[in-house]
Interface confidence: medium
């Protein structure tokens, strides 16, 4: 299977296919073809942070001990095979599930080369019928596989170590003269096959593990830690049109769903039916004056609805997104044909209840009315349902177009790609990346808290065993209270004999304060599930308060906000664990522990096991975090 940049190389077409049919109307424009593609864009920041956090400079470790990187692009075969229909030599039918095996069988096709990626800044993989047959079926007599993969290890390994900029991989239907709708159907099948980018970086050394399913496997007994990323659409059911809105004039098949189903030749009793305007004229469907009749029907085709008494009929859009307040539903309906019924539109957001859309009629020419309803910018992907509710006897209704317009603002957001990350334990247990390096052992042998964590940059993973790990205080006079790193030597703290960051707030005549400042951390990746984790303890009586302040370096100006606070404490002298989501941090930042106390205070304040989650820098949520106070 070939791969190409920019222009894209074919992933195979049958040598002698069926006779050529009319192509897509004027074929597909560049924009339309682009809309058929699935784009994977791994941001440059991910590469920078992966390099800084996981890949030490090459001179600092022996070649044998250097982390390794692998990558692939995987698609489920079943939807692709369904598109092709039954093929000779396929040992399980396209409609049936893949063979039930312990792991999904896969066949790996060659991905792209580094040389081409360097030249064109993006890798284009075109998938056609031949590649599907090669990747999912293979030679006659071989068992069909459940997974088609492109090997991208060379490419990912180069990009993560030496590459610059973002990694862009475009998967699209192979372009060739073929029957109407082919590219659209192939694109839909590609989407249904849930294409996903799989990356792996693992620290080499000794261990024993079977490789996780669907990943290019490292040698099973040769890694100390193993991180895996899957990049896929956070809403795989979104249509390719979700980026550009939807316009359906019924002249060509649309991605709408109909209830009851659209009339076909096998179904003679019909509700929804697509008919050309000439046929409508011959059928004498309109009651208007004869002279007007030819003008009343739009050119091309439209949708006719034949309803019985008190029935409900629905047109349903594909899954959509909107990034614009101006996103609008527009539907053209014929007034004279539906005196006894009414249209209702519903917004159906993902994971939310439906709500009605206010439809405003704008009278058009020759009896046609455009119903418009503002959709705006729902937080989640959504579908739109147009219901025609007939009342009384049989009635006819006509729809000329169904459109969702102005749903993207500026550059279109496309569907949201999530980069999900995980840590694989030696025994095969898979953890979320955030569980690694948090001072809680989640793997049976504790490898999620071992070598990799200790090699993170200063301040990321700190138990104060080796000093202040980046925490500093201003210049101190001999009598100023100071934060110290030492052990809590006390019978009551036998469960915590190691070092901690401590402050003794001994009784003072006037109020006192002490501040300690962390190392600086880089800006988290936008919309990452970023967290700060730490243990804290207050022993004795605190007449005052302790705050944790997050300071952002915003264009040279420092902006601080309190993220945690405890005051006038006289509670249990127990270590408490806290996890603070670091939302909406867009610049590099540091932390400050600020303690203030007054007369009568006799407390020890302690912090330990401070970590910044790796998710901050190596995970991308599909959805942007929505803060409570945005309106």
């Amino acid at each position: 299977v070939g791969s190409g940049m920019g222009t894209g190389q074919r992933a195979g077409s049958p040598a002698a296919g069926p006779p050529l049919q009319p192509r897509e109307p004027l074929s597909y424009s560049r924009l339309q073809r682009k809309s058929l593609a699935v784009d994977f864009v791994v941001p440059s920041l991910f590469r920078v942070y992966a390099r800084d956090l996981l890949l030490p400079p090459s001179s600092s470790e022996l070649k044998a001990g250097r982390p390794e990187a692998r990558g692939s692009l995987a698609l489920d075969c079943a939807p692709l095979l369904r598109l092709l229909g039954p093929a000779p030599g396929v040992s399980w039918t396209a409609g049936s599930p893949a063979p039930a095996e312990a792991r999904t069988l896969s066949r790996v096709l060659k991905g792209g080369s580094v040389r081409k990626l360097r030249r064109a800044k993006q890798l284009v993989l075109e998938l056609g019928e031949e590649a599907i047959l090669e990747g999912c079926v293979g030679p006659p007599g071989e068992a069909a596989v459940g997974l088609l993969q492109f090997n991208l290890s060379e490419l990912f390994s180069w990009w993560i170590r030496q590459g610059e900029g973002r990694l862009r991989i475009r998967l699209m239907p192979e372009k060739k003269a073929s029957e109407v709708g082919r590219e659209g159907r192939l694109s839909a099948a590609i989407r249904a096959s849930q294409p996903r980018l799989l990356f792996q970086i693992f620290g080499t050394g000794h261990s024993s593990l079977e490789s996780p399913t669907n990943m290019p496997s490292p040698s099973p007994d040769y890694f100390t830690w193993n991180l895996t990323w899957i990049m896929k659409d956070s809403f795989p059911f979104l249509s390719h049109r979700s980026r550009y809105g939807l316009e359906c004039s019924f002249d060509f098949p649309c991605e709408l769903e109909y209830s009851p189903p659209l009339h076909d030749l096998r179904n003679q009793s019909w509700s929804w039916r697509r008919i050309p305007s000439e046929e409508a004229s011959q059928m004498d469907l309109l009651d208007g004056p004869g002279a007007e009749r030819s003008k009343e029907m739009p050119r091309g085709s439209f949708l006719l609805l034949n309803t019985s008494a008190d029935s409900k009929h629905t047109i349903l859009s594909p899954w959509m997104r909107s990034s614009s307040e101006h996103c609008t539903l527009a539907v053209s309906v014929h007034r004279h044909l539906q005196p006894s019924g009414r249209y209702i539109a519903q917004l159906l957001p993902h994971n939310e209840a439906a709500r009605e859309i206010l439809l405003m009629p704008t009278p058009g020419k020759h009896g046609w009315t455009v119903l418009q309803g503002r959709i705006g910018r729902p937080d989640n992907p959504f579908r739109v349902a147009l219901e025609y509710i007939s009342s009384g006897n049989r009635s006819l209704s006509a729809v000329d177009f169904f459109a969702l317009k102005n749903c993207s603002e500026g550059t279109s957001p496309g569907s949201k790609m999530a980069l999900q990350s995980s840590f694989t334990c030696w025994n095969g247990t898979v953890l979320q990346l955030g569980q690694a390096c948090d001072f809680h052992q989640d793997c049976a042998q504790g490898e999620d808290e071992s070598q990799m964590c200790r090699k993170l940059p200063v301040g990321f993973y700190c138990n104060f065993e080796d000093g202040f790990c980046g925490w500093t205080q201003g210049t101190l006079s001999p009598h100023t209270p100071q934060w110290q790193v030492r052990t809590l030597k006390d019978a009551r703290f036998q469960d915590h004999q190691d070092h901690a960051l401590l402050l003794s707030t001994t009784d003072v005549p006037a109020s006192e304060s002490a501040t300690v400042t962390s190392a600086t951390f880089p800006a988290p990746i936008k919309s990452s599930p970023c967290e700060l984790r730490m243990s804290w303890l207050i022993r004795g009586v605190l007449r005052g308060n302790v705050s944790l302040v997050l300071v952002e370096n915003k264009t040279g100006k420092e902006q601080g906000r309190m993220v945690w606070h405890v005051a006038a404490y006289e509670g249990l002298s127990l270590w408490q664990w806290m996890v603070l989501p670091l939302l909406d941090v867009s610049d590099r930042f540091w932390l400050q522990m600020v303690a203030w106390w007054g007369q009568g205070s006799r407390a020890i304040v302690a912090f330990d096991n401070i970590s910044i989650s790796l998710d901050c820098y190596l995970t991308i949520s599909g959805e942007d975090k929505i803060l409570q106070n945005t309106a």
């Epitope: 709500r355 405003m360 704008t362 418009q372």
Partner: antibody
Amino acid sequence: LQLQQSGAELVRPGASVTLSCKASGYTFTDYEMHWVKQTPVHGLEWIGAIDPETGGTAYNQKFEGKAILTADKSSSTAYMELRSLTSEDSPVYYCARRRYYGSSSFDYWGQGTTLTVSS
Amino acid sequence: DVQMIQTPSSLSASLGDRVTISCRASQDIGNYLNWYQQKPDGTVKLLIYYTSRLHSGVPSRFSGSGSGTEYSLTISNLEQEDIATYFCQQGSALPPTFGGGTKLEIN
């Protein structure tokens, strides 16, 4: 952001009156303008809405024929004409801008216009 | 139309009190519920949209909760400026409908 409504009106039964709502501080055509009636008996009632961009309107069935909504893009002003007035039409009328996502809330309101229908 | 029943119709509380107002819909409105404040001078402001999301500029002492048909507005630490009438409104089905209002007074 402001929705400035016209002043109080005193009109005779059977007559008509036009209330205005001038928008400022945002792009007028980007948002629908809705009208809400408030009476001591019925509380707040939605009358209808206009999309200033297209001129499209939608009405609560209860107010079909009673209220006519229009908008003038050049002056960023929405109008509501109330016809065949009776004493039942004598409360306060508000214009309100609608935000479309979340839950279709009315995020900014005019200060209200008091209408008195009396002979 | 969806009926919105708001309780109580009036209530009296002291400064610093925690106050809760309830709103019940005649059918499931799927969290499409908003709360408004109307001051004695007639000024109306949006407080909370989509059950619990605070409109910009609204103090954090206001909060909303609920689901299905039952919803509530809570003012956690009553202040003098909170003297007003509060209305709920559903945005799930057309026409939009409002609760009868709760007049809040200070003891």
